[in-house]
């Protein structure tokens, strides 16, 4: 009779996580009698995976009935494979004894586990930034194997090139993680923009995973301020409007000051959205000219999204005339946009106002 050989025909086997792995092993002889054992790894620290003679191995099933006569097929099937099962498996023949004596090992079969990456999670900056600034977005995905993976960034469908990607760990592992940081230059038109992180991996059958982040979470578009004044009404009142335009997000507080005194404070709410995702807001102030002897300096003070206040001032000229006469009043837009903060004092009952 020929000398026993233990044959493991496959050098490597690749299996998707969750599936079963079949590890093939045949012996060339029934002699000597004795059990087959399967191990992962070699040396004293090797892990027993299956013992034909004894033990309970709930995930392992012999492919051939071990009680079958003339059985020389010692292949096993391992169910519900996870990345932790990766490694090299050895089919080892033992000679019957007390204890059994190791006789011959197969050459080993390397089991690699194809595990899908987790859905990419994209996170943006902790604080908002304004147009022309560069912000960083991070994309993370975990638990994939093998290590080879492709990650791309897109902004509104256009591929980005300014990003850095790391796959960890650098050495051999049962599974890997990827982390990529992309730098994106903001524009005022980016409220509706989206960044997409796209991950392609062998386990995804050409259908990449995507994670998205809305630039609306990262951008701040500061407002433009504009004054307009309507001509004097018969009741000596002038309607002055402060237009707050093209801002995002909606969080905005507007304060009217008359000669430096707070006249009214308003909070923006439930504003209609512009096509580009920004908001406009108009506030009116009725100035009772007859209540003033001198020119009135009006200031529209806007605090947007917790940023320092932006001021726009405007002078309403009060002509010298008897109060009862309906005389013309000149108004002048000073055109100043000032940044600075004010003390807010609600003085709403000083004048009659009409506002939206």
């Amino acid at each position: 009779e020929e000398e026993l050989q233990v044959i493991q025909p496959e050098k490597s086997v690749s299996v998707a996580a969750g599936e079963s792995a079949t590890l093939n092993c045949t012996a060339t002889s029934l002699i000597p009698v004795g059990p087959i054992q399967w191990f992962r790894g070699v040396g004293p620290g090797r892990e027993l995976i299956y013992h034909q003679k004894e033990g309970h191995f709930p995930r392992v099933t012999p492919v051939s009935d071990p009680t079958k006569r003339n059985n020389m097929d010692f292949s096993i099937r391992i169910s519900n494979i996870t990345p932790a099962d990766a490694g090299t498996y050895y089919c080892v023949k033992f000679r019957k004894g007390s204890p059994d004596v190791e006789l011959k090992s197969g050459a080993g079969t390397e089991l690699s586990v194809r595990a899908k990456p987790s859905a990419p999670v994209v996170s943006g900056p902790a604080v908002r930034a304004t147009a022309e600034h560069t912000v960083s977005f991070t994309c993370e995905s975990h638990g994939f194997s093998p290590r080879d993976i492709t990650l791309k960034w897109f902004k509104n469908g256009n591929e980005l090139s300014d990003f850095q990607t790391n796959v960890d760990p650098a050495g051999k592992s049962v599974s890997y993680s990827i982390r990529s940081t992309a730098r994106v230059v903001l524009t005022r038109r980016d409220v509706h923009s989206q960044v997409i992180c796209e991950v392609a991996h062998v386990t995804l059958q050409g259908d990449p995973l995507r994670g998205t982040a809305n630039l609306s979470e990262a951008i701040r578009v500061p407002p433009f301020l504009e004054f307009t004044q309507q001509s004097m009404r018969a009741d000596n009142q002038v309607n002055v409007t402060c237009q707050v335009m093209k801002f995002y997000p909606q969080r905005l507080q507007l304060t009217w000051l008359e000669n430096g005194n707070v006249s009214r404070t308003e909070m923006a709410s439930a504003l209609p959205e512009n096509k580009d995702g920004t908001y406009n807001w108009t506030s009116w102030l009725l100035v009772n000219v007859s209540a003033h002897r001198d020119d009135v300096k009006l200031t529209c003070q806007v605090e947007h999204d917790g940023q320092p206040a932006v001021n726009k001032s405007f002078s309403v000229k009060v002509s010298a005339h008897p109060k009862e006469q309906g005389s013309n009043t000149a108004a002048e837009n000073t055109g100043t946009n000032e940044r600075g903060s004010s003390d807010y004092k609600d003085d709403d009952d000083k004048h009659h106002h009409h506002h939206h």
Epitope: K53, E54, D65
Partner: antibody, heavy 119, light 110 residues
Framework: QVQLVQSGAEVKKPGASVKVSCKAS????????INWVRQAPGQGLEWIAM????????HYNQIFKDRATLTTDTSTSTAYMELRSLRSDDTAVYYC????????????WGRGTLVTVSS | DIVLTQSPDSLAVSLGERATINCRAS??????????IFWYQQKPGQPPKLLIY???NRDSGVPDRFSGSGSGTDFTLTISSLQAEDVAVYYC????????FGQGTKLEIK
């Protein structure tokens, strides 16, 4: 350490039945055949039958096919051999034996159960 | 059915001498490249013990003075140098089909 522990001696009347048990330990019970062999006093070995505990497949010696029944209880790793319609010439030591190599051989043996059939 | 016939029925050999027991099958027991013959030793009051499997392979723990040989229909168990503890009845068994035993050979010391 493979061990096969058999039930105690039995005395039966002709025509009765006997059920001998064999409790296995030290190995995976369902992975190996169990054989039953008997030996009448001063006589040779006579193979009765064998059973695969994994699926209860059985093979019987034609001589015993109608009178012997082999069963197993995998939850307790115990094999049973029942012999019916006992006659005086069924008086023998009944052995269970495990087939370690699936070669239809008998590698490990119980110590035997003496069944005496006498009126 | 295959019938096994052992010879002699009994045998007396001096300590240290060679003992030879034969087993003849009524038809060949060779199949799949193996000779399906096994040899057992049974001492008084004990169950049998497997000595040789597949005609020529010593079971674990069996002293190397025991050897098996033969092919097809004729097989031999040899004890090269008889020891006192070898006194027993020896049986051959085949499993070419369902198992049967030879009638046994009683070995004694001369």
């Amino acid at each position: 350490q493979v061990q096969l522990v058999q039930s105690g001696a039995e005395v039966k009347k002709p025509g009765a039945s006997v059920k001998v048990s064999c409790k296995a330990s030290g190995y995976t019970f369902t992975n190996y055949w169990i054989n039953w062999v008997r030996q009448a006093p001063g006589q040779g070995l006579e193979w009765i039958a064998m059973i695969d505990p994994s699926d209860s497949e059985t093979h019987y010696n034609q001589i015993f096919k109608d009178r012997a029944t082999l069963t197993t209880d995998t939850s307790t790793s115990t094999a049973y051999m029942e012999l019916r319609s006992l006659r005086s010439d069924d008086t023998a030591v009944y052995y269970c034996a495990m087939d370690y190599g699936s070669l239809y051989a008998m590698d490990y043996w119980g110590r035997g159960t003496l069944v005496t059939v006498s009126s | 059915d295959i019938v096994l016939t052992q010879s002699p029925d009994s045998l007396a050999v001096s300590l240290g001498e060679r003992a030879t027991i034969n087993c003849r099958a009524s038809q060949s027991v060779r199949s799949s490249g193996y000779n399906w013959i096994f040899w057992y030793q049974q001492k008084p009051g004990q169950p049998p013990k497997l000595l040789i499997y597949l005609a020529s392979n010593r079971d674990s723990g069996v002293p190397d003075r025991f050897s098996g040989s033969g092919s097809g229909t004729d097989f031999t168990l040899t004890i090269s140098s008889l020891q006192a503890e070898d006194v027993a009845v020896y049986y051959c068994q085949h499993s070419r089909e369902l198992p049967t035993f030879g009638q046994g050979t009683k070995l004694e010391i001369k």
